[in-house]
């Protein structure tokens, strides 16, 4: 079963991963995150569904000067176990 507290954030260069993480911690208390091995997407778990929904609302937003970020519900069940 999918857990609605998880979102997937993608579209950033590897070098900007920690900066993007800082930005997404503004939307709620992150409990944990899982980084892809190439560093350009991550799964983020928030403390609540409401916080996750707030992060989802940032889909398509530009961060920094030119980083357009995608945010979608996480569908990777393996990270939720």
């Amino acid at each position: 079963q999918l857990d609605d507290t998880w979102v997937t954030v993608f579209g950033f260069p590897q070098a900007s991963a920690s900066y993007i993480l800082l930005q997404f911690a503004q939307y709620g208390n992150i409990i944990k995150h899982v980084m892809s091995n190439n560093g350009n997407w991550m799964h983020i778990q928030y403390q609540s569904k409401l916080q996750a929904r707030k992060a989802l609302s940032k889909d398509g937003r530009i961060f920094g000067e030119s980083i357009m970020i995608g945010v979608k519900p996480c569908i990777d069940k393996s990270v939720m176990e």
Partner: nanobody
Framework: QVQLVESGGGLVQAGGSLRLSCVGT????????MAWYRQAAGKEREVVAG???????HYADSVKGRFTISRDNAKNTVYLQMNSLQPEDTGVYCC??????????????WGQGTRVTVSS
């Protein structure tokens, strides 16, 4: 399990300074990122300053040139030096530390916050 305890908040007049400290009860010297956030009454949380992976720093535009974030690995502490404080800096300041627990998996730890009030 890491716990974070902030201190150093208080009431200060505009133009004054404060130094916030965030001490980790566990080892936070290997943190992936360390940051300070603030939340003013009725407003959303905002990132104030962060030490990014690799050691570079990030500051909110509103605090650049006034605030400085630093870390002391030997003391498991992250600091926020705040100078030229303005009433708009009032809020609860919260510490956030991210630590890699296993490969590609990171745990997040949050402090309870310390209140900063800047009077005009």
């Amino acid at each position: 399990q890491v716990q974070l305890v902030e201190s150093g908040g208080g009431l200060v007049q505009a133009g004054g300074s404060l130094r916030l400290s965030c001490v980790g009860t566990g080892n936070i010297s290997s943190a992936y990122t360390m940051a300070w956030y603030r939340q003013a009454a009725g407003k959303e949380r905002e990132v104030v300053a962060g030490i990014l992976n690799g050691g570079s720093t990030h500051y909110a535009d509103s605090v650049k040139g006034r605030f400085t974030i630093s870390r002391d690995n030997a003391k498991n502490t992250v600091y926020l030096q705040m100078n030229s404080l303005q009433p708009e800096d009032t809020g609860v300041y919260c510490c956030h530390v991210v630590i890699e627990s296993t490969r590609f998996v990171y745990d997040h730890y949050w402090g309870q916050g310390t209140r900063v009030t800047v009077s005009s």
